[in-house]
């Protein structure tokens, strides 16, 4: 016959915002100022992140959650928890090691971050260019050239649905 004893860790009763204080008979003590514990049963509280310099405080640290930072305007966050700040560019530009550079012809970027991407190739979908692309905007594809031939109806019926991998009959 086997006796089992359930030995519950007294620290498991300590809620978030406290720590299990070994120096005080494992009593649950509140996290000291500028520290937090986001889960129960912790034996230490974590030091709050300080958003210094160009890192601005987006959310203050509390006893149960860390501070959250963002970047001063002109830069944006990168990395887990905004570990880095990266400079913004204007629309129509991308960031390079030489700073912000205009998108090359045939590419665009409609955001302050990210890279220039190629304009959509309308002809791949059998369509024509309705509105030309710019450095800031993609092209707008319109009806196929055949639909715009003289005598063709100005209202084009939708193309029949087809399964992937099958050519239209």
């Amino acid at each position: 016959f086997e006796r089992t004893r359930s030995l519950q860790d007294p620290c498991s009763n300590c809620p978030a915002g406290t720590f299990c204080d070994n120096n005080r008979n494992q009593i649950c003590s509140p996290c000291p100022p500028n520290s937090f514990s986001s889960a129960g049963g912790q034996r230490t509280c974590d030091i709050c992140r300080q958003c210094k310099g160009v890192f601005r405080t987006r959310k203050e640290c509390s006893s149960t959650s860390n501070a959250e930072c963002d970047c001063t305007p002109g830069f944006h966050c990168l990395g887990a928890g905004c570990s880095m700040c990266e400079q913004d560019c204007k629309q129509g530009q991308e960031l390079t090691k030489k700073g912000c550079k205009d998108c090359c012809f045939g590419t665009f970027n409609d955001q302050k971050r990210g890279i220039c991407r190629p304009w959509t190739n309308c002809s791949l979908d059998g369509k024509s260019v309705l509105v030309n692309g710019t450095k800031e905007r993609d092209v707008v594809c319109g009806p196929s050239p055949a639909d715009l031939s003289p005598g063709a109806s100005s209202v084009t019926p939708p193309a029949p649905a087809r399964e992937p991998g099958h050519s239209p009959q």
Partner: nanobody, 123 residues
Framework: EVQLVESGGGLVQPGGSLRLSCAAS????????MNWVRQAPGKELEWVAN????????YYVDSVKGRFTISRDNAKNSLFLQMNSLRADDTAVYYC????FGYGDSHYGMDVWGQGTTVTVSS
């Protein structure tokens, strides 16, 4: 502790010069690109210049080209910005920042920043 500490800021007359320094500690300085970034009063943060690990590549924002020179001394874990022909619109807090290139192909994030040094250009 990873740290960057700027110095050398101050009040200077238009047309004058200043040399900013940035002392790095707590990391292998020679492994990183380094940057100068500034924030003028009431303006957004603006990248000024960067320099690669061995100092062979240097790039500048258009507004400072020909006037500012970025350099580094890896033996002394130091970054510098020589600022000549200073103008009123150069007035700003100048930050030294680690990174800027070499983290990956798609971004130029700067992860370690100094506290900044203030440059005021006024007569």
């Amino acid at each position: 502790e990873v740290q960057l500490v700027e110095s050398g800021g101050g009040l200077v007359q238009p047309g004058g010069s200043l040399r900013l320094s940035c002392a790095a500690s707590g990391f292998n300085f020679s492994n990183y690109w380094m940057n100068w970034v500034r924030q003028a009063p009431g303006k957004e943060l603006e990248w000024v210049a960067n320099i690669n690990q061995d100092g062979s590549e240097k790039y500048y924002v258009d507004s400072v080209k020909g006037r500012f020179t970025i350099s580094r001394d890896n033996a002394k874990n130091s970054l510098f910005l020589q600022m000549n022909s200073l103008r009123a619109d150069d007035t700003a807090v100048y930050y030294c920042a680690r990174g800027g290139f070499g983290y990956g192909d798609s971004h130029y994030g700067m992860d370690v920043w100094g506290q900044g040094t203030t440059v005021t250009v006024s007569s």
